[in-house]
């Protein structure tokens, strides 16, 4: 069937499915040291892990790839692990003249689902 | 340097990277041969290939998670081709009294992006 | 654009509670970074900051006052409170909340006058 | 706690005067210094971030320096806007910090 298990119940055990996992990375890491200024370090949330049939499917198409790739595995990828949505996050730039404040919508991941 | 390649030219060769690709599908592929009366075949527009360095990347996030997977690629995932748009698709239901029609705007991808 | 007001009691006696509330407008309070923090001013002196609150809910306080300071947010009314307890007349002062971006503080609120008095 | 201190407590300078006020910390804050500027009943407005990082809108003629336990703010050339009392803030750690401000007049 296609609901065998929970859609948010991961039958590879615990860590491996698809969820939010923090990375730490510097400005240097990402190479905007030249024009970001604060903050200097970023806790930046990332999806990772697999995506089992049907777990957290992100839609109908994500449940039929899911679907699919049971049948066609050469052909039809799994669904992968993706952002749902994101949380902004302010970073002060450098400017010609000084700094200023900008946000970003789409920089750290707050959920996640596989799509 | 973050722009060595144009984010649309693909350097693993011709079909290589993430793109549409079309899967033929019956209803009883779907699983969908007992709700749906039509279509009987769908022709699925699906995203699939690989995501190479800022390769169509959906946005910030994504061109963060291709630097840090090239720092960390134990750790960090490469980004992967997904949906960036829908193509509405009508299906005939079977009902209990007969047919209707409805629209699904998450079933057939139009475009794919590396996230 | 980045507005904030605060808004309080005016006048209270000594040893009541004083609660003030910061409403944002222009950015959220959940936003990574982004944090909203309490100063005040008596007349004719100089800034005392005293407490702060970030996006994820970390707190900070005066050393001072902290028995006395409690902060808190409500990220969907945009709204951040800070109470004060058993004030007394030392406490009088204009209160201000500002926005706080990665430690200093890049918008303020125009004030609110808090006088304690018998 | 980290203790600020300006200097002096209060400057008369004339219009286009090159007007310099120090803040000096009592422990190494690094470049983590702010400087703000409060006109009469208004609420302090931000200046410089980051010791030397002049804020969107402010004017060129304002400036910062320093690091470690010395600071400058300097207006390169005095208007008679500038009339106000200005303050520096470490935020290099808890709890933050204000200078006891400048007072800053014109003769």
């Known amino acids: 069937s296609a609901h065998a298990h929970p859609r948010d119940s991961c039958p590879l055990g615990p860590g491996r499915c698809c969820h939010l996992e923090t990375v730490q990375a510097t400005l240097e890491d990402l190479g905007w040291s030249d024009w970001v200024l604060s903050p200097r370090q970023l806790q930046l949330s990332m999806c990772v892990g697999e995506c089992p049939h049907l777990y957290r499917s992100a839609n109908t198409h994500a449940q039929i790839k899911a679907r699919l790739h049971g049948l066609q595995p050469d052909k039809v990828p799994a669904p992968c692990c993706v952002p749902s949505s994101y949380t902004p996050v302010v970073l002060m730039h450098r400017t010609d003249s000084g700094v200023s404040l900008q946000t970003y919508d789409d920089l750290v991941a707050r959920g996640c689902h596989c799509a | 340097s973050a722009h060595a390649h144009p984010r649309d030219s693909c350097p693993l060769g011709p079909g290589r990277c993430c793109h549409l690709e079309t899967v033929q599908a019956t209803l009883e592929d779907l699983g969908w041969s007992d709700w749906v009366l039509s279509p009987r075949q769908l022709q699925l527009s699906m995203c699939v290939g690989e995501c190479p360095h800022l390769y169509r990347s959906a946005n910030t996030h994504a061109q963060i998670k291709a630097r840090l997977h090239g720092l960390q690629p134990d750790k960090v995932p490469a980004p992967c081709c997904v949906p960036s748009s829908y193509t509405p698709v009508v299906l005939m239901h079977r009902t209990d009294s007969g047919v209707s029609l409805q629209t699904y705007d998450d079933l057939v991808a139009r475009g794919c992006h590396c996230a | 654009q980045v507005q904030l007001q605060e808004s309080g009691p005016g006048l209270l006696k000594p040893s009541q509670t004083l609660s003030l509330t910061c409403t944002v407008s222009g950015f959220s309070l959940s936003t990574y970074g982004m944090g909203v923090g309490w100063i005040r001013q008596p007349a004719g002196k100089g800034l005392e900051w005293l407490a702060n609150?970030?996006?994820?809910?970390?707190?900070y306080y005066n050393s001072a006052l902290k028995s006395r300071l409690t902060i808190s947010k409500d990220t969907s009314k945009n709204q951040v409170s800070l109470k004060l307890s058993s004030v007394t007349a030392a406490d009088t002062a204009v209160y201000y909340c500002?926005?706080?971006?990665?430690?200093?503080?890049?918008?303020w609120g125009q004030g609110t006058l808090v006088t304690v008095s018998s | 706690d980290i203790q600020m201190t300006q200097s002096p407590s209060t400057l008369s300078a004339s219009v286009g005067d090159r007007v310099t006020i120090t803040c000096k910390a009592s422990q190494n804050v690094g470049t983590n210094v702010a400087w703000y500027q409060q006109k009469p009943g208004q609420p302090p407005k931000a200046l410089i971030y980051?010791?030397?990082y002049r804020y969107s809108g402010v004017p060129d003629r304002f400036s910062g320096s320093g690091s470690g336990t010395d600071f400058t703010l300097t207006i390169s050339s005095l208007q008679a806007e500038d009339v106000a009392v200005y303050y520096c803030q470490q935020y290099n750690s808890y709890p933050l910090t204000f200078g006891q401000g400048t007072k800053l007049e014109i003769k």
């Open positions: 980051s010791a030397s």
């Open positions: 609150i970030w996006w994820n809910d970390d707190k």
């Open positions: 500002a926005q706080e971006v990665y430690g200093w503080f890049a918008y």
